[in-house]
Amino acid sequence: ESALITQQDLAPQQRAAPQQKRSSPSEGLCPPGHHISEDGRDCISCKYGQDYSTHWNDLLFCLRCTRCDSGEVELSPCTTTRNTVCQCEEGTFREEDSPEMCRKCRTGCPRGMVKVGDCTPWSDIECVHKESGTKHSGEVPAVEETVTSSPGTPASPCSLSG
């Protein structure tokens, strides 16, 4: 595999079961969906829904399939050649700097800002300053900070959820 492998990625100990398909390696490597035998003579298929390999490899085992966490939806299941694809549920997003969990999207923008981008599974709502158009990357505003127009008028669009 081209990616760095950590021990958490690995499938539980397994020996080649009789039902696992075998083929011969090509130039010492096995195709995606397989791992190599100890003696390097056979390619052993990964187990569908349990483990996978995405690249030509000479690894002794396939990588363990990811299980989607609560708060995530499964976009596509794990196959022998591709890991599970999980996505944050609606109203939540996953940041690059904290990929281990889905965080709730903000429900509105801070005072003096307008919403220019909706909540998506991979990004929070995007707010910019009304005047300058500068992006805001601050923390979730306090409820009273959420932008509303002057008293008695309807809330501006940036106070609605995305």
């Epitope: 020996r15 190599i36 000479d58 002794l60 085992f61």
Partner: nanobody, 123 residues
């Protein structure tokens, strides 16, 4: 974190025997190979022997076949190398290494290495 600690090296006369050990910790891979490599003074790393943890597949370099025996104790997570009929040319630092690749007799296939233990064969 994977750690490998070799022991058992020392000075021995030609024709004598030594048993090297390599205690491994932090290994939770479903299968892996453990090997002995050696480096003689002024020379490069040379593959000596390998054994796989799950199926027990074993490899030896031609230069040690019939004289050296590799074995493992799964319960202690320890690798051994029984060296008999030692010769002056067996003098080297012996390293224990771990791989997660099949048919691994090349150094580049090994991800984890011990610090080494010195074996000197001399009269």
């Amino acid at each position: 974190e994977v750690q490998l600690l070799e022991s058992g090296g020392g000075l021995v006369q030609p024709g004598g025997s030594l048993r090297l050990s390599c205690a491994a910790s932090g290994l939770t891979f479903p299968n892996y190979g453990m090997s002995w490599f050696r480096q003689a003074p002024g020379k490069g790393l040379e593959f000596v022997s390998a054994i796989y943890w799950s199926g027990g597949t074993v490899y030896y370099a031609d230069s040690v076949k019939g004289r050296f025996t590799i074995s493992r104790d799964n319960s202690k997570n320890t690798l051994y190398l029984q060296m008999n009929s030692l010769r002056a040319e067996d003098t080297a630092v012996y390293y224990c290494a771990v791989t997660i690749r099949g048919a691994a007799t090349q150094t580049w296939k090994y991800d984890y290495w011990g610090q080494g233990t010195l074996v000197t064969v001399s009269s």
